[in-house]
Every structure is written in structure tokens, then in C-alpha cells.
Interface confidence: low
């Protein structure tokens, strides 16, 4: 059984067109992985944080399109580290429908460099590791441009990065990695 949480970057670093593509990607991946024992949740972050649906809410309404369609982009600064902490503490929580013995999988979709975040990755990644959260990172748009961004994606992801980091130049290219991500998650579930 897997509990899969999406953490999506809705900050000003994401152009609106790519944000729409991110939503399509999430819906499609959810459809592809939708088995009776897989639950999904989703949080969007910028300098604000919005839980769009919890595992419990997904269980009550397991319709990816209807859950993802109403999401609108927050805009603002890019507080990725705080977002990761919130997912680990709030979404992967039994009060929100997370299951004690399920695999915890976090899929972070981000433009790369965090900005203005009071927390660093060193504040949040060890906690995610302790909680057994397997982290996949998808860098969109600008994330593939700079070495600093690439380094950041590697820091967020579980080790080794080559198995947990995907990079796409734009939202359109997200389609190309849907199957790769699905295969990796199926492999975790055995």
C-alpha cells in the first residue's frame, strides 16, 4: 500500500502555462497509479501553503480530475523547505488519513531554487528521512537551467539522486516522465 503526497510549486517562479501542465501531470499520474490500495493527497506551496485534498478526502472522493481541476496558482515566494516539513508533519499524519503501514511517497514538483524560506533543507530533510518518506523531485522550467537549481533538486530527493530526480525544460515535457515515475513507484510497491 502507498500513500502518495504531491507537493506542487505554485510560486511566482512557475509561469501559468507550466502550472496548468503540472496539474494535468498530477491528474494523469493519479489516474495511472489509482489502485484500490493507493491514496493521494496534495499541497500547493509558495510563501503560503494550501492543502487541496488529504488522503482521507481522496478516499471519500477518489476522482483525480475533480480534485485537481479547481486548484488555482498561489503566486509569491518559494518556500520549498517549509512545504516539505508541512507535508511530512501534516499530510503524512493519521488524522489526515495517512496509514501507519503504507509506503510514504512524496512527489515534489518545483521550479528549483527556494526563495525567502525561513527554513533550510538541513532543517527538514533529516526529519523526512526519519519518517521514512521516499522523495521524488521533478524540476520544471528554470530548474534545469542553473547548477544551483540542480543541486537543490538533488538535496530534496531521496538518494541516489539519479533514481529520484527528473528534469524537464517545460510543462509540456512532463508527459514524457509520467511512465518513468509510475514504474519507479510500482517498483517500491513490489
Amino acid at each position: 500500500d502507498s500513500d502518495i503526497a504531491f507537493l506542487i510549486d505554485g510560486s511566482g517562479s512557475i509561469i501559468p502555462h507550466d502550472f496548468r501542465r503540472m496539474k494535468e501531470f498530477v491528474s494523469t499520474v493519479m489516474e495511472q497509479l489509482k489502485k484500490s490500495k493507493t491514496l493521494f493527497s496534495l499541497m500547493q506551496y509558495s510563501e503560503e501553503f494550501r492543502i487541496h485534498f488529504t488522503f482521507k478526502e481522496f478516499q471519500n472522493n477518489p476522482n483525480p480530475r475533480s480534485l485537481v481541476k479547481p486548484i488555482t496558482q498561489l503566486l509569491g515566494r518559494t518556500h520549498t523547505a517549509t512545504g516539505i516539513r508541512k507535508v511530512v508533519r501534516e499530510l503524512f499524519n493519521i488524522t489526515n488519513g495517512a496509514r501507519k503501514n503504507a509506503f510514504k511517497i512524496l512527489v515534489v514538483i518545483t521550479a528549483g531554487e527556494k526563495f525567502g524560506d525561513p527554513l533550510g533543507y538541513e532543517d527538514v530533510i533529516p526529519e523526512a528521512d526519519r519518517e521514512g518518506v521516499i522523495r521524488y523531485v521533478i524540476g520544471v522550467g528554470d530548474a534545469s537551467r542553473s547548477e544551483k537549481s540542480r543541486q537543490e533538486l538533488n538535496t530534496i530527493a531521496s538518494k541516489p539522486p539519479r533514481d529520484h530526480v527528473f528534469q524537464v525544460n517545460n510543462g509540456e515535457a512532463l508527459k514524457t516522465i509520467q511512465n518513468q515515475l509510475r514504474e519507479k513507484i510500482f517498483a517500491i510497491e513490489g
Epitope: 511566482g12 517562479s13 509561469i15
Partner: nanobody
Framework: DVQLVESGGGLVQPGGSLRLSCTAS????????MNWVRQAPGKGLEWVSV????????NYADSVKGRFTISRDNAKSTLYLQMNSLKPEDTAVYYC??????????????????RGQGTQVTVSS
Amino acid sequence: DVQLVESGGGLVQPGGSLRLSCTASGFTFSNYAMNWVRQAPGKGLEWVSVISSSGSRRNYADSVKGRFTISRDNAKSTLYLQMNSLKPEDTAVYYCAKVRDAGYYRWNLNDLDYRGQGTQVTVSS
């Protein structure tokens, strides 16, 4: 009224350097990410570089990466573009441009609302 005034352009030989400046007024400069864009003869507007409001974050178009450096002095409300190893294909009118919304780190041309009158950069031997 928002005003952006670019300066520092000129004629330079390939491999040479220039430093462009953009002086801003009419808005709280330190609250806004700023961009440099350029327009080569007969071409459309091309994004060059962006810097965040605080100056801690920057990005560059692939075509200028490693050669151009964007910076800002919020106390002077001035934006800079240091251009090194200039090439003939860098010939263009360079404009500084303000992001529409305060606090947003944006470089999509659709998100820029004001730009200056531009400064001509010509790279030729």
C-alpha cells in the same frame, strides 16, 4: 509615474565589455524583481536576465550565461548588467523591465509591465 532610464550602451569590439545601468523612480524599487530584455534588429523581444527584489536570486538566458551578470543597488534604485565577452549576436537595444507584481520572481515577458526607452549595444569590429 514609473520611470526607467537605461544608460551605458555603445559600440564595442567582439570580446569587449560594457556595463549597462537602469535608474528607476516612481515605485518602491526594492519590492520588485527586475529584468533585462533586448531586441535585436528585425527580431522580437528576448528575455536576458532577472534578479529578485533583494538581489539574492538571479537567472540568465542560456545565450548569455557565464558572460553577463545582473546586479542591483536598492539604496540607489539602480539595476545593472555587466556584459563581458561580447559577441556580434549581442547587438540589440537593451531595456530594463519591471515585474508587474511586488514580491514575485518572474521573467515571463507577459509578467513585465514597464520598461525604459532602451540603450543601444553594438558589437562589431
